[in-house]
Interface confidence: low
């Protein structure tokens, strides 16, 4: 009978409409641990983030610290130089001076 | 009749699986898009990971060339005070004979 | 000079509750992250967990709802200690933690857990 | 979470040799770590810092290296009075620190 046949029919689709629900299912459950992953991933790595930057600050402020200190040193290179050059000098003239005496 | 009441149950127990399964379907594209933002967020700091990594490898390495500079500036440093110490040692020495003399 | 004196160690039955104290001389605690380091007799240095400048705290996964850091006033910081077992018997150290590097430790304060 | 695993977990040498001990963080953590050293009945005490800064006062025979999750020190020269167990500290973010489980360096 048509009712038979509408019935057939209606336990067809509803089965059909079980799979689909457990396929959704399934996928839903697999994305839902990749989208876990992918968050912990983003989370971890924005804390790399925070640790590298910390690290990069560290670093360029102990550049500019060192940057400071070469510089300083040079300069006194620089003075020790001079300083050694007059003295150089003086010891020079105060020798011409004692030959000449 | 039996028939009818079974037909009907399987009629409502498929509308009741139809609606799971748009609510599966809305759930899982929800969760796609979060998974794709997730990944591009995950992929955006990685890279931003690398970029600072090669920062932070590059002045490492710049901190230890200004640590073997300071080093070298040190000793240039310590060897001229010496010179300089045995110049004006020299020059008392010297001024010492010419009094004496 | 700067120094960290931990105190408030002694003998408490398992399941019980403590409060060590940090106290710090010598040392500007709102410019500093101080942390809570123990070591149990003949076992290596484990991480408790640090209070930041803005008193934000962050804790070991295993110390997370047991342990409790707080800065207590300008000059101490606070441990406390929740359902204790005998594990938790070990010698604990305040540390001053700048940069991710703790740079200057007290002596301890040996806990002690047992019936 | 972080984790350091630390090798090897106990070395010897004689004195003026090279000892070498490394450590892997779970995690890259750039040049956050620090070693220390532990002798019994003391608190640590600080060594290197930033995987290659020397604290102050440290002797010049101590040397950190390594980047990112492998990190090394090396005692090049060894003293009586560095038998000790030495320790790693990483720091992952601003919060997150976890220590290796020690290396114990006696004298031959």
């Known amino acids: 009978t048509a009712n038979s046949v509408a019935c057939r029919d209606g336990l067809r689709a509803q089965a059909e409409c079980r799979n689909t629900t457990h396929l959704l299912q399934r996928q839903l459950t697999r994305t839902q641990d990749s989208l876990l992953q992918a968050e912990t991933q983003a989370n971890s790595c924005n804390l790399t983030v925070v640790t590298l930057q910390e690290s990069l600050e560290k670093k360029v402020s102990q550049a500019l610290e060192q940057q400071a200190r070469i510089k300083e040193l040079e300069n006194e290179v620089t003075k020790l130089n001079q300083e050694l050059e007059n003295l150089r000098i003086q010891k020079e003239t105060s020798s011409t001076v004692q030959v000449n005496s | 009749t039996a028939n009818s009441v079974a037909c009907r149950d399987g009629l409502r127990a498929q509308a009741e699986c139809r609606n799971t399964t748009h609510l599966l379907q809305r759930q899982l594209t929800r969760t796609q898009d979060s998974l794709l933002q997730a990944e591009t967020q995950a992929n955006s700091c990685n890279l931003t990971v690398v970029t600072l990594q090669e920062s932070l490898e590059k002045k490492v390495s710049q901190a230890l060339e200004q640590q073997a500079r300071i080093k070298e500036l040190e000793n240039e440093v310590t060897k001229l005070n010496q010179e300089l110490e045995n110049l004006r040692i020299q020059k008392e020495t010297s001024s010492t004979v010419q009094v004496n003399s | 000079q700067e120094q960290l004196v931990e105190s408030g160690g002694r003998l408490v039955t398992p399941g019980g509750s403590l409060t060590i104290t940090c106290t710090v001389s010598?040392?500007?605690?709102?410019?500093?992250?101080m942390g809570w380091v123990r070591q149990a007799p003949g076992k290596g240095l484990e991480y408790i967990g640090i209070?930041?400048?803005?008193?934000?705290t962050y804790y070991a996964s295993w110390a997370k709802g047991r342990f409790t850091i707080s800065k207590t006033s300008s000059t101490t910081v606070d441990l406390k200690m929740t359902s204790l077992t005998t594990e938790d018997t070990a010698t604990y150290f305040c540390?001053?933690?700048?940069?991710?590097?703790?740079?200057?430790w007290g002596q301890g304060t040996l806990v002690t857990i047992s019936s | 979470e972080l984790d350091m695993t630390q090798t090897p977990s106990s070395t010897s040498t004689a004195v003026g040799g090279t000892v070498t001990m490394n450590c892997q963080a779970s995690?890259?953590?750039?040049?956050?770590l620090a070693w220390y050293q532990q002798k019994p009945g003391q608190p640590p005490k600080l060594l290197i810092w930033?995987?290659?800064d020397l604290a102050s006062g440290v002797p010049s025979r101590f040397k950190g290296s390594g980047f990112g999750t492998q990190f090394t020190l090396t005692i090049s020269g060894m003293q009586r009075e560095d038998a000790a167990t030495y320790y790693c500290?990483?720091?992952?973010?601003?919060?997150?620190?976890?220590f290796g489980a020690g290396t114990n360096v006696e004298i031959k």
């Open positions: 540390v001053r933690s700048p940069g991710g590097s703790a740079d200057l």
């Open positions: 010598g040392i500007d605690l709102s410019g500093y992250a």
């Open positions: 930033y995987a290659s």
């Open positions: 209070i930041g400048t803005s008193d934000t």
């Open positions: 500290l990483g720091t992952y973010g601003s919060g997150v620190r976890a």
């Open positions: 995690q890259n953590i750039g040049i956050n």
